[in-house]
């Protein structure tokens, strides 16, 4: 049979290297030789390229080399397939060389901030050595912060006569390290070069961009003064590398601004002892370049009643995230403060906090929380300068099976009855929320039975046992990840009862 007609002809001019055309050869049953017929020099010259490879994949491509390549130029390319049964020709295809030229990537040699110009870096590069002299080049510059994975892109063109191979990238974050890569193409071409090697550069430092402020209210002391732990951190979106030399804090009773107290610190928290009335606390951070905007927080009076609006709250794990959702009865509340810390018996030292706006849910990556640890999560509604009553739940980012089973005892042994009691597993050993307990019991040499009860029950009465019979009993505590048995206990039912 005749060979299949070559289809899908595609050509690329790897600038000053070769012009390579490829095609789909079709299913060939016998050896097929391909000849690429070309007219070039605007139709004034023609020649052929014959595939000479024995492997079928390599036979579907052929290259023309310098100096028989001109640009600009118009080519016609036709592929002939020939086997023992005859010759078949492809459609004639037409190519403008400028439209299919592909160059080497440019080389970035410097990425630097421009003195005195904020939030900008200047990229300097060398044009690819092999690029058409007669064509303008278009560029794509892609950039990302060092700790991000998603690229942003900008496109621009450079005139071929432009000696200045630089681009000013603006609208960046201050004092942030960026990764830059550049690619180029002949302006008329559909083929982009590969990306250049990546280069790093950093924007200039600025004054700190702001703070987020929060507090932990503690019970009033005997003298009526109340300890308030102030916590703060860089505002969301602040540069990762932003430097702070220190913090200025000032506070005063709401009723009297004249009683302002001020203090400085380099820590990221501060314990204040305030009177029972309401207070305003303000603070700024500063570095060698200036001060941040002021962050302000109102501390309510001890006897002040806080509003309540969260009706229900639940936590679940979805796609590597812990998701907390709640419902609110107050439509005008759209800012919430989330606090979370591990539920350990000692005083929590690692309180984390974060605000949420325009949403009634909060997510955190599972890997930001310790697996198998119970966390206390509280959500505070915030309306203007008022902080509402929190709603708290406990949750695990990842559950495991308990590391030990319940400590079990047998009580009230009767002829046919017995009471099995067990203790809660210590918090540190639970590894998850205990959802139920299962009591396994079995008469010596007999059939085993089990009974599951919910996690609020810590004892269970077994009935209809055989008199004067040895039993083995074991209690299993289960989380969503599975269960762990406690130690097994043996007991023997009585042969008769005082009531018999």
């Amino acid at each position: 049979a005749l060979p299949a007609k070559p289809e899908n002809i595609s050509c690329v001019y790897y600038y000053r290297k070769n012009l390579t055309c490829t095609w789909s050869p079709g299913k060939e049953t016998s050896y097929t030789q391909y000849t690429v017929k070309r007219t070039y020099a605007f139709g004034e010259k023609h020649d052929n390229c014959t595939t000479n490879s024995s492997t079928s994949e390599n036979r579907a491509s052929c290259s023309f080399f310098l100096p028989r390549i001109t640009i600009p130029d118009n080519y016609t390319i036709e592929v002939e397939a020939e086997n023992g049964d005859g010759v078949i020709k492809s459609h004639m295809t037409y190519w403008r060389l400028e439209n299919i030229a592909k160059t080497e990537p440019p080389k970035i040699f410097r990425v630097k901030p421009v003195l005195g110009i904020k939030r900008m870096i200047q990229i300097e590069w060398i044009k690819p050595e092999l690029a058409p002299v007669s064509s303008d080049l278009k560029y794509t510059l892609r950039f990302r912060t060092v700790n991000s994975t998603s690229w942003m892109e900008v496109n621009f063109a450079k005139n071929r006569k432009d000696k200045n191979q630089t681009y000013n990238l603006t609208g960046l974050q201050p004092f942030t390290e960026y990764v830059i890569a550049l690619r180029c193409a002949v302006k008329e071409s559909k083929f982009w070069s590969d990306w250049s090697q990546e280069k790093m550069g950093m924007t200039e430092e600025e004054a700190p961009c702001g703070l987020e402020l929060w507090r932990v209210l503690k019970p009033a002391e005997a003298d009526g003064r109340r300890p308030v732990r102030l916590l703060w951190k860089k505002a969301r979106g602040a540069p990762v590398l932003e430097k702070t030399l220190g913090y200025n804090i000032w506070y005063y009773p709401e009723s009297n601004t004249n009683l302002t107290e001020t203090m400085n610190t380099t820590n990221q928290q501060l314990e204040l002892h305030l009177g029972g009335e309401s207070f305003w606390v303000s603070m700024i951070s500063y570095n060698s370049l200036g001060k941040s905007p002021v962050a302000t927080l109102r501390i309510p009076a001890i006897q002040e009643k806080s509003f309540q609006c969260i009706e229900v709250m639940q936590a679940c794990v979805a796609e590597d995230q812990l998701v907390v959702k709640w419902q609110s009865s107050a439509l005008d509340v759209n800012t919430w403060m989330i606090e979370w810390f591990p539920d350990v018996d000692s005083e929590p030292t690692t309180l984390s906090w974060e605000s949420v706006s325009q949403a009634t849910n909060w997510t955190i990556q599972q890997d930001k929380l310790k697996p198998f640890w119970c966390y206390n999560i509280s959500v505070y509604p915030m309306l203007h300068d008022k902080v509402g009553e929190p709603y708290s739940i406990q949750a695990y980012a990842k559950e495991g099976v308990p590391s030990e089973g319940p400590e079990t005892k047998v009580e009230n042994i009767g002829v046919k009855t017995v009471t099995i009691t067990w203790k809660e597993i210590p918090k540190s050993e639970r590894k998850g929320i205990i959802c139920n307990y299962t009591i396994f019991y079995q008469a010596e040499g007999g059939k085993g039975f089990s009974k599951t009860v919910n996690s609020s029950i810590l004892q269970y009465g077994l009935e209809s046992l055989k008199r004067k019979t040895s039993y083995i009993v074991q209690v299993m505590a289960s989380t969503s990840a599975g269960g762990t048995n406690g130690t097994s206990i043996n007991f023997k039912t009585l042969s008769f009862s005082v009531f018999e």
Epitope: E44, L66, I69, T70
Partner: antibody
């Protein structure tokens, strides 16, 4: 800037071979064909052949086909022209010349300074 | 092979003169002709290619014309530094061939 520097003058006996080198700088060596042209004393220019350093492809003037070998070493950006079975009429200045423009292949844009080869018994 | 016939083989002219050199190809070579200038003891220098495109850095007094088989190099106003030998060359395809040269001398 683009520069082609050729090896020094040679004196050879008839029947011998000569190998002239041409070191390129200031551009991507593999991106341009390198031609060899000779000029006998008081005579015109005669094209001998070329090499494409990218793929090693050569193209020779049939007049020299049997005696000339043009090679290129990408690692040193150097082209070589070897002419064998020398006779007295091969006495000439031998030039390497880089292929020039995108829109004008086979134009000799940049030339080496020339190497005088004298064939004499 | 394509033969290139150049004329005249030499000419005398004065500074400021308009000089014309012609070259004839033995077959149609469209506009694939280049012109070179060579001074004694020096390598040739490319002036014109594609019959009429000036090479980089070449003074505008040099111009080329023609297509098919007949080509011309014109120096509109001869300068002292233009006294040299001029060669035409076809760059249609290999083998490349040159004209015999035209020596431009001071009158």
């Amino acid at each position: 800037q683009v520069q082609l520097v050729q090896s020094g003058a040679e004196v050879k006996k008839p029947g011998a071979s000569v190998k002239v080198s041409c070191k390129a700088s200031g551009y991507t060596f593999t991106g341009y064909a390198m031609n060899w042209v000779r000029q006998a004393p008081g005579q015109g220019l005669e094209w001998m052949g070329l090499i494409n350093p990218y793929n090693g492809g050569t193209d020779y003037n049939p007049q020299f086909q049997d005696r000339v070998t043009i090679t290129a070493d990408e690692s040193t950006s150097t082209a070589y022209m070897e002419l064998s079975s020398l006779r007295s009429e091969d006495t000439a200045v031998y030039y390497c010349a880089r292929d020039g423009y995108d829109d004008g292949p086979y134009t000799l844009e940049t030339w080496g300074q020339g190497t005088l080869v004298t064939v004499s018994s | 092979d394509i033969q290139m016939t150049q004329s005249p083989s030499s000419l005398s002219a004065s500074v400021g003169d308009r000089v014309t050199i012609t070259c004839q190809a033995s077959e149609d070579i469209y506009s694939f002709v280049a012109w070179y200038q060579q001074k004694p003891g020096k390598a040739p220098k490319l002036l014109i290619y594609n019959a009429q495109t000036e090479a980089q850095g070449v003074p505008s007094r040099f111009s080329g014309s023609g297509s098919g088989t007949d080509f011309t190099l014109t120096i509109s106003s001869l300068q002292p530094e233009d006294f040299a030998t001029y060669y035409c060359q076809h760059h249609y395809d290999s083998p490349l061939t040159f004209g015999g040269g035209t020596k431009v001398e001071i009158k």
